[in-house]
């Protein structure tokens, strides 16, 4: 079985302020089980935008249906975008762990940059 | 970390309906199948049915589908399991079950609900 | 449906010893490069523990001494050196269609 591989298509993404941004991301294997994260930046700092897990993310929906069966689709939406979101965003893999899961695999990411709405 | 919390046992005469509950904490209830699974004393596993709380599909194992039914309540995290026309053979722990991987398995249990069909 | 047949009902295995339980699927469980097979310890009073998923990977904290092969139809569940701990029901499970489980192994100390 191959190594699970994180696949983030788009180097960058440009979105008009106010419009939805669509943040490619698959993987490659159904192995190992655990979910899916996505995060703005890298680092300790780095800023949680969506737990398939657990959370509740409102300007967030997901592209394809995560629960149907063999999903290795994990892209996201994120509306009513505005210069505050511009940034580099990650597409994480995590293993299932206990008690809680485990990094897995980043993708290489996505920058994403915010063109202002025309007057 | 994800818990399921199952009702209490129950006793019922034969021709009865039960109705047991299973409350998931830990994680988004949409974005995982809950599986349930019934054990006789004594015997083995079998798998009654399942469903995906973010739209409600269900799969139903043929010899249940006629007398169970499966439903959740999404604001309360529960899933629910009725069974009707209750016999002495449906006499049994009943299990929920949640699939982590989407792969159609039982990642994490509750602890069960014993029902007792008798006269 | 698939019916999973295993062997044998029961097995008695010596501490330290290597315990081998047998999963045979009436059709192929293989999907696009998975075999769609799960297997779960129980102990009595409790409720099944997941141990190998997809065949052949470890679940979350199970330890190394269990693994798990096969493909298409036969499978096994090996775990290496039987501790005591290790005493318990062991079933398989298939998904490649609806789940079926098969109707257990009891592992006992010899």
């Known amino acids: 079985e191959e190594e699970l591989q994180v696949i983030q298509p788009d180097k960058s993404v440009l979105v008009a302020a106010g419009e939805t941004a669509t943040l490619r991301c698959t993987v490659t294997s159904l192995i190992p089980v655990g979910p899916i994260q996505w995060f703005r930046g890298a680092g300790p700092g780095r800023e949680l935008i969506y737990n398939q897990k657990e959370g509740h993310f409102p300007r967030v929906t997901t592209v394809s249906d995560s629960t149907k069966r063999n999903n290795m689709d994990f892209s996201i939406r994120i509306g009513n975008i505005t210069p505050a979101d511009a940034g580099t965003y990650y597409c994480v893999k995590f293993r299932k762990g206990s008690p809680d899961d485990v990094e897995f695999k980043s993708g290489a990411g996505t920058e994403l940059s915010v063109r202002a709405k025309p007057s | 970390q994800v818990q399921l919390v199952q009702s209490g046992a129950e006793v019922k005469k034969p021709g009865a309906s039960v109705k047991v509950s299973c409350k998931a904490s830990g994680y988004t209830f949409t974005n995982y199948w809950i599986n349930w699974v019934r054990q006789a004393p004594g015997q083995g596993l079998e798998w009654i049915a399942m469903i995906d709380p973010s739209d409600s599909e269900t799969h139903y194992n043929q010899i249940f589908k006629d007398r169970a039914t499966l439903t959740t309540d999404t604001s309360t995290s529960t899933a629910y399991m009725e069974l009707r026309s209750l016999r002495s053979d449906d006499t049994a722990v009943y299990y929920c079950a949640m699939d982590y991987g989407s792969l159609y398995a039982m990642d994490y249990w509750g602890r069960g609900t014993l029902v007792t069909v008798s006269s | 449906d698939i019916v999973l047949t295993q062997s044998p009902d029961s097995l008695a295995v010596s501490l330290g010893e290597r315990a081998t339980i047998n999963c045979r699927a009436s059709?192929?469980?293989?999907?696009?490069?998975?075999?769609?097979i799960f297997w779960y310890q129980q102990k009595p009073g409790q409720p099944p523990k997941l141990l190998i998923y997809?065949?052949?990977n470890l679940d979350s904290g199970v330890p190394d001494r269990f693994s798990g092969s096969g493909s298409g139809t036969d499978f096994t569940l090996t775990i290496s050196s039987l501790q005591a701990e290790d005493v318990a029901v062991y079933y398989c499970?298939?998904?490649?269609?609806?789940?079926?489980f098969g109707q257990g192994t009891k592992l006992e100390i010899k």
């Open positions: 997809l065949a052949s």
């Open positions: 499970q298939e998904s490649r269609e609806l789940p079926t």
């Open positions: 059709k192929s469980v293989s999907s696009s490069g998975y075999n769609y």
